[in-house]
Interface confidence: low
């Protein structure tokens, strides 16, 4: 239904709170440079236009549509042309290209200083000072730093993030309350964050069919007792939810995720028997809980999937009349029956009888030419299967950080002309898949596994398309959204490769390593780690070895020692010396 | 280097039980996978067996399984295999190997370093 003002009919349906953190975090996911402050005046500007057209919707502008309010009110920054360069050129354009134009230019690793967690002491006044500044400040530095973040999900981590706050600031011992929530927030930011990214890239890059598929795989295992019917349904709301917010469409998407959970709890006897728990919260957690809902069971008996998608003779008359639909009833059926296969996986076994069915129902005789259409699932099972075993196997051995390492020389073999924070970033969490995955049993780890590798993997994609170094990574990234991993695992060592010049530098530490916590100064050494294969990629598992086993030795020794700066710049060319006479260099 | 020496191997029954060790030394160091192979008269290597370095885990081709059992020792540096039930086709040359453990444990090319071997023979 149409309504006079877009912009009332959103702040009316969101509320005044909703709505300004909303348009704070549009705002500040497309011009990530620009100061707090200049973000808040913008929204607040914002706000008050919203409630003169809440009040008169035949007001003057209120009737124009929010890419256009919004791009005008983000075009008055003076700033603009200075600090964003090219971007500034979008506001020449009329929209939607304009919106397009701003689209393009959100950039995954913005120029931006870490975030450091000032005292605990420190953050409890600041909060009980100003609770509201304070809140929309996290807002603010997660989504400029994070510029595809689900914004209606970003609204739940921002009151989790309140709530930890209001119990920890005024507790005894502060601290301990404290920063085990705000580490939680942390990583599952992160998480949330990587995995939406790949919703958008497969909207933006592979198209809404592909994002559908995805979906319906995904919905048919949460849901296996739904029918078919009502997966679709779902699926095309989701699409749409996640649409507007890839777009940047934020109050959209908001609104109509809060629309697609009443419906699904208004609907959970034909949908899931697993949300009832979930339906009895308030609105931002009942939609969390619901994306991250488990599985509900199998339906009893159900048939084989052989009679209607292999031995039925209207196979080809079916998939003729209605391909996507066809090939999707194929997919629900699959999925609700695998909750034990990776999405990914399922998308392959999809395309590949897609494949056959394009290529035999043109054949004299289609059903001889299909019968043996499942024979061909085996090895693309069985693939994934044994490559996870393997890896669980190298993980219980080796524990997360040396898996890291194996991981780390493993992919800068492969591709050593990316640059190496990206490398350690990537390798470092595919690593993460061992402490995630390999502790479910057999018939959760690959769902576990290969999907958690794909949002890694798009990591790496998204971050190599803003600067692109690798013709195979660009290969693996831009050929198949499936088949990213499988592309990627069977990279071998890049014999192209003109191994880097030696620079001492690189290889020169300070007496600042000594004060990092754990994690920084294991980055500090897996820094080293990339940078030396990039120096001898044919270096063997045992030098590098022996060069990292001295290279932690000399770092402790000289942690322990009175002058740590003489000790780091003495001890420091006596390891380069050895390091080079040990590599050959 | 990592030397690796087989010790335990000899002439049995079918039936009757063994253990090998291997000792490692040298560069040792934890995160090897301690794995045990086999040459048979005529017959390419293969796998029998492998341990984590924790000892946790191990793996075992079909044909040993419920019979042979590899646990490893890391303050003495060694790696056993207690076989049981010994069968005439378990006669072979075994040896001892040590690896990283990037990839499946069940191929040669795992592993870095290997024993010289000991001659095991079961007759009927």
């Known amino acids: 239904d149409a309504h006079k003002s877009e912009v009332a009919h959103r702040f009316k349906d969101l509320g005044e709170e909703n709505f300004k953190a909303l348009v704070l975090i549009a705002f500040a996911q497309y011009l990530q440079q620009c100061p707090f402050e200049d973000h808040v005046k913008l929204v607040n500007e914002v706000t008050e236009f919203a409630k003169t057209c809440v009040a008169d919707e035949s007001a003057e502008n209120c009737d124009k549509s929010l890419h256009t309010l919004f791009g005008d009110k983000l075009c008055t920054v003076a700033t603009l042309r200075e600090t964003y360069g090219e971007m500034a050129d979008c506001c020449a354009k009329q929209e939607p290209e304009r919106n397009e134009c701003f689209l393009q230019h959100k950039d995954d690793n913005p120029n931006l200083p870490r975030l450091v967690r000032p005292e605990v002491d420190v953050m409890c006044t600041a909060f009980h000072d100003n609770e509201e500044t304070f809140l929309k400040k996290y807002l603010y530095e997660i989504a400029r730093r994070h510029p595809y973040f689900y914004a209606p999900e970003l609204l739940f981590f921002a009151k989790r993030y309140k709530a930890a706050f209001t119990e920890c600031c005024q507790a005894a011992d502060k601290a301990a309350c404290l920063l085990p929530k705000l580490d939680e927030l942390r990583d599952e930011g992160k998480a949330s964050s990587a995995k939406q990214r790949l919703k958008c890239a497969s909207l933006q890059k592979f198209g809404e069919r592909a994002f559908k598929a995805w979906a319906v795989a995904r919905l048919s295992q949460r849901f296996p007792k739904a029918e078919f019917a009502e997966v679709s349904k779902l699926v095309t709301d989701l699409t749409k939810v996640h649409t507007e917010c890839c777009h940047g469409d934020l109050l959209e998407c908001a609104d109509d995720r809060a629309d697609l959970a009443k419906y699904i709890c208004e609907n959970q006897d034909s949908i899931s028997s697993k949300l009832k728990e979930c339906c009895e919260k308030p609105l931002l957690e009942k939609s969390h809980c619901i994306a991250e809902v488990e599985n509900d069971e199998m339906p009893a008996d159900l048939p084989s999937l052989a009679a209607d998608f292999v031995e039925s003779k209207d196979v080809c008359k079916n998939y003729a009349e209605a391909k996507d639909v066809f090939l999707g009833m194929f997919l629900y059926e699959y999925a609700r029956r695998h909750p034990d296969y990776s999405v990914v996986l399922l998308l392959r076994l999809a395309k590949t009888y897609e494949t056959t069915l394009e290529k035999c129902c043109a054949a004299a005789d289609p059903h001889e030419c299909y019968a043996k259409v499942f024979d061909e699932f085996k090895p693309l099972v069985e693939e994934p299967q044994n490559l996870i075993k393997q890896n669980c196997e190298l993980f219980e051995q080796l524990g997360e950080y040396k898996f890291q390492n194996a991981l780390l020389v493993r992919y800068t073999k492969k591709v050593p002309q990316v640059s190496t924070p990206t490398l350690v970033e990537v390798s470092r969490n595919l690593g993460k898949v061992g402490s995630k995955c390999c502790k479910h049993p057999e018939a959760k780890r690959m769902p576990c596994a290969e999907d958690y590798l794909s949002v890694v993997l798009n990591q790496l994609c998204v971050l190599h398309e803003k600067t692109p170094v690798s013709d195979r990574v660009t290969k693996c990234c831009t050929e198949s959204l499936v088949n990213r991993r499988p592309c990627f695992s069977a990279l071998e060592v890049d014999e192209t490769y003109v191994p880097k010049e030696f620079n001492a530098e690189t290889f020169t530490f300070h007496a600042d390593i000594c004060t990092l916590s754990e994690k920084e100064r294991q980055i500090k050494k897996q820094t080293a780690l990339v940078e030396l294969v990039k120096h001898k990629p044919k270096a063997t598992k045992e030098q590098l070895k022996a060069v990292m086993d001295d290279f932690a030795a000399f770092v402790e020794k000289c942690c322990k020692a009175d002058d740590k700066e003489t000790c780091f710049a003495e001890e420091g060319k006596k390891l380069v010396a050895a390091s080079q006479a040990a590599l050959g260099l | 280097e990592v030397q690796l020496v087989e010790s335990g191997g000899g002439l049995v029954q079918a039936g009757d039980s063994l253990r090998l060790s291997c000792a490692a030394s040298?560069?040792?160091?934890?995160?090897?996978?301690m794995g045990w192979f086999r040459r048979a008269p005529g017959k390419e290597r293969e796998f029998v067996g492998a341990v984590s370095w924790s000892g946790t885990n191990t793996w075992y081709t079909d044909s040993v399984k419920g019979r042979f059992t590899i646990s490893r020792d890391n303050a003495k540096n060694t790696v056993y295999l207690q076989m049981n039930s010994l069968k005439p086709e378990d006669t072979a040359v075994y040896y001892c190997?040590?690896?990283?453990?990037?990839?499946?444990?069940?191929?040669?090319?795992?592993?870095?370093?290997w024993g010289q071997g000991t001659q095991v023979t079961v007759s009927s």
């Open positions: 040298g560069r040792t160091y934890t995160p090897y996978v």
């Open positions: 190997a040590a690896g990283d453990g990037v990839g499946i444990y069940r191929y040669e090319h795992q592993y870095d370093y």
